[in-house]
Amino acid sequence: ECVTKVFKDISFQGGDLSTVFTPSATYCRLVCTHHPRCLLFTFMAESSSDDPTKWFACILKDSVTEILPMVNMTGAISGYSFKQCPQQLSTCSKDVYVNLDMKGMNYNSSVVKNARECQERCTDDAHCQFFTYATGYFPSVDHRKMCLLKYTRTGTPTTITKLNGVVSGFSLKSCGLSNLACIRDIFPNTVLADLNIDSVVAPDAFVCRRICTHHPTCLFFTFFSQAWPKESQRHLCLLKTSESGLPSTRITKSHALSGFSLQHCRHSVPVFCHPSFYNDTDFLGEELDIVDVKGQETCQKTCTNNARCQFFTYYPSHRLCNERNRRGRCYLKLSSNGSPTRILHGRGGISGYSLRLCKMDNVCTTKINPR
Amino acid sequence: ECVTKVFKDISFQGGDLSTVFTPSATYCRLVCTHHPRCLLFTFMAESSSDDPTKWFACILKDSVTEILPMVNMTGAISGYSFKQCPQQLSTCSKDVYVNLDMKGMNYNSSVVKNARECQERCTDDAHCQFFTYATGYFPSVDHRKMCLLKYTRTGTPTTITKLNGVVSGFSLKSCGLSNLACIRDIFPNTVLADLNIDSVVAPDAFVCRRICTHHPTCLFFTFFSQAWPKESQRHLCLLKTSESGLPSTRITKSHALSGFSLQHCRHSVPVFCHPSFYNDTDFLGEELDIVDVKGQETCQKTCTNNARCQFFTYYPSHRLCNERNRRGRCYLKLSSNGSPTRILHGRGGISGYSLRLCKMDNVCTTKINPR
């Protein structure tokens, strides 16, 4: 059920996944919508508590039943993710936040004319996720017009504080406004030896690239295919970064593929959704439900319509000597990061992903063939 | 692979599940062995850091590969759980710890002759998990000979501090030495309305009772069977307690069963293992692996031999028109608490649990038919 209404002075009790900091309840809902498991959120508005370190906290929540008890809490704003909603969604957030300092790793500072130019600098810098700009009204004259580019592990500020004379905002890469190079090539027989920031399991290099694209700090990736000799590393998608923003060392190895995040690709929001079916492939994960359905398309639709389902494996009916029952078995699954925990072959399953993230791809994106 | 050796001045990096406090590395390994997911541990010995609040920390760890990187750390002791080992195990710990104060909820204090009598008091008190006894050498004369009975949510101390003149230790209930009443009856059509401390999913009331028996604070339970009218509560096992140690209110309801923890049952260590097969029953959980095997017994053995496997579902081969391949499919599974996340019927699976916890039941126990 799609619930767009937010509940003022209400907190959802329990179900906490994690806490991040966001400048508004709207942005908190955006984070919840993109989080692999978040279905509900509680945002602690300014002045919601005597302790300012708790202001702007965005508490991401999950629930097996998709609901949680509501309790009164002054200054809290609660609501539901848009996962359950049909409308087109965007990760793009053009809002700027006056008198808010969004804290992160300040890795670059420069003097620029205005906040718009600061946001453009952030958008055109590989590492920048958000910025804080000291306006002409900033109390310290020496720091006026200073543009601080920032990043964190999560892509959201570590904390947010009130600070007069500053303006903060997010990179507009996901609005398709970056002027940095968009490298669509996938390089075969290549391993990149740079920093591993995370690793996930993926069925192919294209899914690995999509995961890298909407990971907050991934700049490029290496994917080990099913034919990779080290069994424990097969289907591993290594999400990578480097200080320079480019790979430092390329190692030539068969059955590995490497490539870049598509976060800078103009006129296309990062490709969020993985529509393919993977034959003779089982996606392992945490099981949500088992339902009997006709065909893998129906299984995928069943997964898409279940807010908690992230991926599925469908077993066609092999009772060929009993033609009456042509329904197969559809296993609905999830995991902590939205990716299978393992991928197996040769067991007759047909696997794929929920299509609920497809609505985060804009019209331009869907015209681009991911291959 | 069974590794009994401990590694001094070594810490395992990553894989943290949770941190508890234990008086020794040996007890830390015991906790890890009984934890549903723990495969490795790092124990911070006394003087391991400048911060005494970090001493005696027992960090429970898991790893998909069953190994973790080792890093040098002065005062750390690391090792592996005994889940991977063939030997008989016991939850019984008769050791006492001199000059250590194990902190918890001090709910009862009395003057007794010696530490042994204090340990007996703890063993014969329904709530007591561990104790601290002030000896005749305790600095404060007024508190000498004082026996403090303690409990915590987890069954392990909240912290452990050095304190001259005290002796601490654990209840000997799991050694079969409690003199409290052992009530083996299971009461049909009964719901107990007392405090719920936890809830798990179980296939029957006997498994529910076993889970209650080795839960640190469960004194009695209520189980809702498959025929319970509220679908969302079917197979739910409510773990319960009360201040008095006995149920206060019994409500008569069909398709519910209630009973008591067997923690006080003499000459039998709590029954840890669930050997039955459950026909036409699917246990849902996080999938570890899928293997083709002949028969549910082999499936159970495969699960037992996999240190991370907690339960399984086996699908017999239905290719009756092709008699050659009589192997069925064996799904190895786990969850955060060792119990299925859901139980479904009518899908043709045969489910059961790993038998690796059977080695925690002593000879006396295994002679007692759980039914």
Partner: nanobody, 124 residues
Framework: QVQLQESGGDSVQAGGSLRLSCIAS????????MGWYRQAPGHQCEFVSH???????YYADSVKGRFTISRDNAKNTVYLQMNSLKPEDAAVYYC????WGGGRSTCVNPIGYWGQGTQVTVSS
Amino acid sequence: QVQLQESGGDSVQAGGSLRLSCIASGFTFDDSDMGWYRQAPGHQCEFVSHITNDGTTYYADSVKGRFTISRDNAKNTVYLQMNSLKPEDAAVYYCAADAWGGGRSTCVNPIGYWGQGTQVTVSS
């Protein structure tokens, strides 16, 4: 039990040489790619050198021409010969098997197998 044990770290003057060794056990050494990574205090983990299972070698630009990686499959050992050492080469050096990159906060990360590190100090 997989183990990688580095040795050879020491304090040397700038311009000096050191040879690091890493003995591997608990896995099939011949099939594994081996590498050296380093981390200086306050810096991120840095790739140093890599040798594939078939003997192909790779180096970071900062060490090319000065460092040489080699392996002896009979001894399950990988070496790093470091010549013309500079103060900026000072770091903890980690040996890794099938690692494909260090971690963000520390070199040691769940991908591949890692040693515990050996300290190299270079004074000017």
